[in-house]
Interface confidence: medium
Amino acid sequence: HNTTVFQGVAGQSLQVSCPYDSMKHWGRRKAWCRQLGEKGPCQRVVSTHNLWLLSFLRRWNGSTAITDDTLGGTLTITLRNLQPHDAGLYQCQSLHGSEADTLRKVLVEVLADPLDHRDAGDLWFPGESESFEDAHVEHSISRSLLEGEIPFPPTS
């Protein structure tokens, strides 16, 4: 799998989309997991509703939400109030039994918060950044990881 990069702004919301073949993955629940190390396990963050027919319902774990359009074949993950520690490698998964197929490998990059540079004369409400429903705070800049690019930031 190629890795797709999604960039989001710190303090705002990031939407990650994972397209898949809706027929091939019919009846399967989906999950979002975080890769622990380059060869480590993928730790489950959140999964879709236990009843596959209700996969369209948004489920939350902390600040991460998941929803699945099973007909259209798009899994959507929302990372609310994105923070620097959210940066890293993730996977969208399709579950069957105890197995999991990787739908997409995702590298989340967190950009600096431009709000930090707003001056006092601006009218800014904290809740505007927290509200993932507001279209103007949704950012999803994605690109494919180039061959040879390292999906993990160097450890300090």
Epitope: A120, L123, G127
Partner: antibody, heavy 122, light 113 residues
Amino acid sequence: EVQLLESGGGLVQPGGSLRLSCAASGFTFSTHAMTWVRQAPGKGLEWVSAISANAGKTYYADSVKGRFTISRDNSKNTLYLQMNSLRAEDTAVYYCASLRGGYEVGPTFDSWGQGTLVTVSS
Amino acid sequence: DIVMTQSPDSLAVSLGERATINCKSSQSVLYSSNNKNYLAWYQQKPGQPPKLLIYWASTRESGVPDRFSGSGSGTDFTLTISSLQAEDVAVYYCQQHYIWPITFGGGTKVEIK
């Protein structure tokens, strides 16, 4: 010393219009967001409208949306509130206030004028 | 809209005694990016405009006496006057400055017993 002086209040009939002004001095008006807050006689505070320093952003309470317009003239250090289609329930003392804003603080009203009374009655 | 509910509506306290005012918001006003609560308190004396006392739930505005203190987080907040003075007779309002529309509590009238 920060001074905010409201004017333009008075008695107006329902359906009528008024334009309130707020003359600011003692601070750099052009770098401060501003707001209008009202208080009906014997009642609590109700936020009405706010405008960013460069007038690029405006907000209105649902109760006045479509009837009131906030504006400012930074060259005259003056804030305005154009009030149209006035109703009896708009009767109140109208205060103008400077907003301490920006990323960290969020809008708090740090300096207030003395207010101007608007009475809507036939 | 965030609804701010204050209690009690009025409060009579002896001079030098503690006065406590509560404010509850219908949703959290805690901004998780900086862990600050966007809740302010104002004092309005008879015939005067309101005056900012506290913002971020617990940060006193400069010049405000230290007998005024704010506490709380999320949805439940308290303004405390540790030792009531005659000049503290006023109506006190909480206000959320977390998201528009800005909303105020209904006010609490503090009197001397």
